[in-house]
């Protein structure tokens, strides 16, 4: 019996036309939601004038349906047993699952003003930019609607820049009508232990963002893993959102709608400083903001964002060093609410439930040539928003899964 089940599993998890895995892989049967909480700044003038602590108040959730589009340009390569595809991006606002509308306004860091002196460290350029910032009446903070902040708005300061640059700014701009990829993954036909593992991303086996092994694209995209998952296994996956590969370790056994699953969690040491976890040394790419690589819990992904000072962390700076969160008031990190986990069915390796939580932050530094920033006495890693992307197998699918997989094994 066991041999037969193993044979069936091996056949059905292969990523090719006609298998159970392939059908779900092309277009997920799970409804995926992305909830946003925006950090509304309560004391913008005080911060800009006196370099005070930034007082934030989270507002949310504002919920969007995501990952509802099928993979496109799916091409099998029988030579190397891979399948390539792109994942289209789309987001649909869900008013019934939100605390307000997309037109709700927030006071947040002025993304363009904060980024300008970071991208252009040359004094002459900064003096030129300063005159445009003043002319556009821009300042350190701005009021923007949810829709503008997430998906893009025409920035008044950038619109005055006299050379060709993108004048539209948004945390996720551009998103709708864009694609992630090309991904090329092993289909598992020749070796089931490699199924769904990424062979290349955007035509490359490395990211070109990090030095050494930190630059490697490891594992799958976290939607599934090679079958017969053991608790002792470290699940490696690549997340384009955070521009790096990361890993999850076994946390606990869970019953999900009658299906036994393993909950894998992102451990704190994945966000540790090289001092605590030497393996992370190549994720520390600058020495000043990181206090000579002793700070932890934030990841500078600027290289992956055209040089913009974007830092990724866990929500509310969970697992981050005190120096990171000290200049910010109003954060309340909580392991249950703010950690990321994957609930993986161990026989098939399918992720049947997940919660991906991350926070987007922008670094703002004192800039003597930019009047809006020249009163700052220290750098701040400013939280802009955090998100919770979740998906759970539907009741119907769960029943089907039980009869076809777990039921047969029992």
């Amino acid at each position: 019996g066991d041999m037969l089940i193993e044979k069936t599993i091996k056949r059905e998890v292969v990523l090719e036309e006609g298998t159970t895995a392939f059908k779900n892989w092309v277009k997920t049967g799970t409804t995926v939601y992305r909830q946003f909480w925006i950090f509304d700044v309560q004391n913008p003038d005080d911060v800009a004038k006196n370099s005070s602590k930034i007082k934030v108040k989270q507002r949310g959730p504002y919920t969007y349906r995501v990952r509802y589009l099928a993979k496109e340009n799916i091409t099998q390569d029988p030579e190397d047993h891979t399948v390539s595809f792109v994942q289209p991006n789309g987001a649909i606002f869900e008013p019934s699952l939100s605390v307000g509308t997309e037109d709700d306004n927030f006071t947040v860091l002025n993304l363009a003003v904060a980024a300008a002196p970071h991208i252009y460290q040359n004094s002459f350029v900064q003096v030129v930019l300063n005159s445009l910032i003043k002319k556009s009446k821009s300042s350190m903070f701005q009021t923007r609607s949810l829709k503008e902040l997430l998906w893009g708005y025409k920035d008044p300061f950038l619109s005055l820049v006299p050379y060709p640059i993108s004048t539209t700014v948004g945390v996720f701009y551009p998103y709708n009508d864009t694609v992630d990829g090309v991904y090329k993954v092993f289909n598992g036909k020749d070796n089931i232990s490699k199924v769904a593992i990424i062979e290349s991303y955007k035509g490359k086996r490395n990211l070109s963002y990090w030095p050494s092994y930190c630059d490697m694209i490891n594992g799958t995209d976290a939607a599934s893993f090679p079958p017969f998952v053991e608790k002792s296994r470290t699940l490696r996956f690549f997340s384009s959102d955070i521009c790096r590969s990361i890993y999850a370790v076994f946390g606990s056994e869970i019953d999900l709608k009658g299906i036994p699953v393993y909950r894998f969690v992102l451990p704190a040491n994945a966000f540790a400083s090289p001092l605590q976890n030497p393996d992370n040394h190549c994720f520390c790419t600058e020495k000043v903001i990181s206090n000579n690589c002793t700070s932890y819990g934030v990841l500078d992904i600027g290289k992956c964002k055209e040089g913009k000072p974007v830092y990724i962390s866990l929500p509310h700076f969970l697992h981050a060093s005190p120096d990171v969160s000290e200049p910010i008031e109003g954060l309340h990190p909580n392991e249950d609410e703010h950690r990321t986990y994957l609930d993986v069915e161990p026989i098939t390796g399918f992720t049947l439930q997940f919660a991906k939580r991350l926070q987007v932050n922008i670094l703002v530094k004192p800039a003597r040539k930019i009047e809006a920033l020249k009163n700052l006495k220290r750098p701040y890693i400013v939280p802009i928003l955090w998100l919770n992307e979740t998906g759970t197998i539907g009741d119907e699918k769960a029943e089907m899964f039980k009869t076809q997989v777990t039921g047969k094994i029992k």
Partner: antibody, heavy 118, light 107 residues
Framework: EVQLQQSGPELVKPGASVKISCETS????????MHWVKQSHGKSLEWIGG????????KYNQKFKGKATLTVDKSSSTAYMELRSLTSEDSAVYYC???????????WGQGTLVTVSA | ETTVTQSPASLSMAIGEKVTIRCITS??????MNWYQQKPGEPPKLLIS???TLRPGVPSRFSSSGYGTDFIFTIENMLSEDVADYYC?????????FGAGTKLELK
Amino acid sequence: EVQLQQSGPELVKPGASVKISCETSGHTFTEYTMHWVKQSHGKSLEWIGGIYPNNGATKYNQKFKGKATLTVDKSSSTAYMELRSLTSEDSAVYYCARDRYDVWFAYWGQGTLVTVSA
Amino acid sequence: ETTVTQSPASLSMAIGEKVTIRCITSTDIDDDMNWYQQKPGEPPKLLISEGNTLRPGVPSRFSSSGYGTDFIFTIENMLSEDVADYYCLQSDNLPLTFGAGTKLELK
């Protein structure tokens, strides 16, 4: 070592134009602003304008708008300044000077003497 | 445009004496003042940059102070090699503007 090498002296007739060059070495040309400064005989210094080679952004002193045009050739790491409709008032030594991030005019060329005479 | 008024226009000092040059700006420029030395037949040389920062390799007898609109450049013990023209430059806003210069001679 950063070096700025300017073209030689020019004797030009009134109404004509002249193009001065400033060849740089020893640094990443595109990352630093190149400025041009005028010094009339026995007089002070006047900032003409600056160009940021990375994106070609230029800024001129209003006084020299229409008189000077700043350009760069990234392939040869050379900055140029063209002066047009020359009069005796334009007779001066012209310097190119380069920034170092937050330091203005950290490096200077040796100067180019332009003499406007009939 | 920020105008920079430099004084005195010329100065005759003996070796070992303290030299003081002043620049006053028409607008508040924080501490965005720079000081240059120019010897005959040579381009200017940066001595002190914004924030009263002495440039590497410049002797410590040179210093500057000031904030806002009033700035002082000092040579603590003048040496014969300090004979030159000295210029201040405001770099707070464009156009960048220089002072008219101070000619420092030996008494």
